[in-house]
Amino acid sequence: MMTGTIETTGNISAEKGGSIILQCHLSSTTAQVTQVNWEQQDQLLAICNADLGWHISPSFKDRVAPGPGLGLTLQSLTVNDTGEYFCIYHTYPDGTYTGRIFLEVLESSVAEHGARFQIP
């Protein structure tokens, strides 16, 4: 039975040219996290595997950095980066948990950030 829940940074916004941290956190379960996949709509951005470490898709290598933790840092943002991002937690024995983040990249110099949380 899957008892865990995914907390995410929710809806967030950032300035064009800036960077943003995408973070998810799995709680309320003792399941072992074996891998986390990060996707942007229909593109695989990066994978963090418990044994193999990080793999960043080559087409995103220049603008995506691993971490902090299981999170992902997007750099040199463009308006085309606006959209849905998903963190997919592969766990044992629970199975798969998915979290959703919506990022809006703003042209203006004022970018209001949505709800955020700290990961210890």
């Epitope: 074996t34 891998q35 996707e39 229909d42 593109q43 695989l44 994978i47 595997n49 044994d51 193999l52 793999h55 898709s57 087409s59 592969h90 044992y92 024995p93």
Partner: antibody
């Protein structure tokens, strides 16, 4: 250099059993998911089974479920496929393959031929 | 199960030609799509993973594109060693499934 070497194929009668082995070298075997894929003579590729690096999860094609068992011995760097109740339609070359991140199959063995015939 | 439909099943081309092979999934598979090359009597070889990432050591004339349900493998300038059978494969969910293959023959 990554190497995968299958063995254990051969001729077996319908209803019989075989155990295939895949000896791995050149990488940290225990860190990778592993797969068996088969190819019937003159046909395309068919995934058979896979196992996570820790043996915690095993997955099977419907066509072999209940008859084949995938396993691994990380101390021996070896992957296995126990095949029971073999049928003529199981005749194929069986390949083992490494599956990093459970997303792609980057290295394959040379294959071992299993022939099921009376 | 996710069905993978490859087209064409075979094609004839000349050295230097641009060759395009398509693969369609029966449901969205994000970018969990890989391409393999197989020559007679040999094991498959990974060319492209995650739809568009070129596997190390594979010539840059091979490229992949697409996401969701529609994917393409392109060989920009066909070389003599490229005559082979090509397979797409989805890894979005188990059972992993392959396309039926495309045999690239010499015209």
């Amino acid at each position: 250099e990554v190497q995968l070497l299958e063995s254990g194929g051969g001729l077996v009668q319908p209803g019989g059993s075989l155990r295939l082995s895949c000896a791995a070298s050149g990488f940290t075997f225990s860190s990778y998911g592993m797969h068996w894929v088969r190819q019937a003579p003159g046909k395309g590729l068919e995934w058979v089974a896979s196992i996570k690096y820790s043996s915690s999860n095993k997955y099977y094609a419907d066509s072999v479920k209940g008859r084949f068992t995938i396993s691994r011995d990380n101390s021996k760097n070896t992957l296995y496929l126990q095949m029971n109740s073999l049928r003529a339609e199981d005749t194929a070359v069986y390949y083992c393959a490494r599956g990093p991140y459970d997303v792609w199959l980057d290295y394959w063995g040379q294959g071992t031929l299993v022939t099921v015939s009376s | 199960d996710i069905q993978m439909t490859q087209s064409p099943s075979s094609l004839s081309a000349s050295v230097g030609d641009r060759v395009t092979i398509t693969c369609r999934a029966s449901q969205s598979i994000s970018s969990y799509l890989n391409w393999y090359q197989q020559k007679p009597g040999k094991a498959p070889k990974l060319l492209i993973y995650a739809a568009s990432s070129l596997q190390s050591g594979v010539p840059s004339r091979f490229s992949g594109s697409g996401s969701g349900t529609d994917f393409t493998l392109t060989i920009s300038s066909l070389q003599p060693e490229d005559f082979a059978t090509y397979y797409c494969q989805q890894s979005y969910s188990t059972p992993l499934t392959f396309g039926g293959g495309t045999k690239v023959e010499i015209k």
